[in-house]
Amino acid sequence: GPVWRKHYITYRINNYTPDMNREDVDYAIRKAFQVWSNVTPLKFSKINTGMADILVVFARGAHGDFHAFDGKGGILAHAFGPGSGIGGDAHFDEDEFWTTHSGGTNLFLTAVHEIGHSLGLGHSSDPKAVMFPTYKYVDINTFRLSADDIRGIQSLYGDPKENQRLPNPDNSEPALCDPNLSFDAVTTVGNKIFFFKDRFFWLKVSERPKTSVNLISSLWPTLPSGIEAAYEIEARNQVFLFKDDKYWLISNLRPEPNYPKSIHSFGFPNFVKKIDAAVFNPRFYRTYFFVDNQYWRYDERRQMMDPGYPKLITKNFQGIGPKIDAVFYSKNKYYYFFQGSNQFEYDFLLQRITKTLKSNSWFGC
């Protein structure tokens, strides 16, 4: 069945049941996600605007899918398996009486079950499993996933230590001078350099030692966290930001309307689901898109891919690859490639690495 092909997943609570305080709803949903993040490499982040991977909805009767709710009792909730659009979304029947305790229907316990579906789990035949199809109240203070639940979710995503580069469980700001720090995306924006990581970005103003950390949502509330690639076309005052199979256009530091759009509008084949890194070279007026161990070259004037691509990164960028995390263009002759906690200054005229640095070397660490 389907799974999320990433470990950083956003959710949004679309609306709130009047049965509970908003804070109690937020807490129940957060704790329910935490149940699954505790046993997997997955990390969940709540967003308040924009498109989340998982939308949490309280609704009654017919509510915008093929599966109308049935009034009090019976079907309590349903959730869609991972995917775009409605994929991953969890719907709770507003005709139930949602509670924080054993009376009515416990929101936390129901949400744990539904989020299991949102992550790709089916029902379990083990009556002790939270993924067993029928609702049964258990003490939420001592609640634990069954061995069957853990086996199921870890068969899809692995165990928690399988991805050390994920954001901190509490989503706190990563330590800037951590020698293992890596970045999701890096780009110039005028005379500044933006370094993206999880839901944060650092701003480095050229030649100044001081850097500042910011939430992506504080600058661009409609953008998601976990930006995966970015590039700038300075002459047009444009910045392109990528996440999964979508991209956003920022003009003069303002998000353009009618975005996100599909990365496939650039001409990528269907199998490309995300961009690892991107960089625009104003000398050639070409953008290089890095995907796994390959790269594409896009003609920004003709708005189409150059023929003969993709090519292997290792074949054409000596010493770089096979995969990269981020890249940006600087000083009219260098690409700065980021791979994990390492960074390579690459002279594209000489076509070789001229310096090896730590990824956070820009911050005076």
């Epitope: 915008g64 093929f66 599966h67 869609f80 979304d89």
Partner: antibody, heavy 122, light 103 residues
Framework: EVQLLESGGGLVQPGGSLRLSCAAS????????MHWVRQAPGKGLEWVSG????????IYADSVKGRFTISRDNSKNTLYLQMNSLRAEDTAVYYC???????????????WGRGTLVTVSS | DIQMTQSPSSLSASVGDRVTITCRAN??????LNWYQQKPGKAPELLIY???SLQSGVPSRFSGSGSGTDFTLTISSLQPEDFATYYC?????FGQGTKLEIK
Amino acid sequence: EVQLLESGGGLVQPGGSLRLSCAASGFTFSWYWMHWVRQAPGKGLEWVSGIVSSGGTTIYADSVKGRFTISRDNSKNTLYLQMNSLRAEDTAVYYCAKDIRGPYSSGLFDYWGRGTLVTVSS
Amino acid sequence: DIQMTQSPSSLSASVGDRVTITCRANQSIYTYLNWYQQKPGKAPELLIYAASSLQSGVPSRFSGSGSGTDFTLTISSLQPEDFATYYCQQAGIFGQGTKLEIK
């Protein structure tokens, strides 16, 4: 490449029966919800019926409930629509359409067949 | 029951024009709205899903927006091949269609 090919359409008298088939290829048929959507001549699109990947859950538009039966044979990669007690207003091109996989239908039809024409007339 | 109202039912425009088609639901459908294009004698093709996501292979001149009850499909610069009928859809309910014709 995903392909859906409908067959079984034709001319039938009111009250008669017809069975439509949709042969699927280019994807793992047994993972996906499948649907029938119809279009009367010169009119808009009307959803008819859907079936879960396993075949265990079926859903119908009110206009066909009790008369039409959707089914599938995953071993043959084929979707069916058994149409009984046909009426003149059932005259339409019938399309089969692919949905996403999962226990619930997304209502997102990403691939469609070319359609087969059913004419109900005396 | 949920109903979808699409407008206009027909529209005349010229190549290069910017065109907007709207779809309204009688209750919130969140972002669960899709747009399809259908050319005469052909099957419908998915253009936009989840209100604003462009289906793979669809040109970027097509865009969708909206959430809740009000949705729009925009074609930023009409091309000759865009003259067709457009449908909004949410689960088992389709809008009545908008026929886009050459002026």
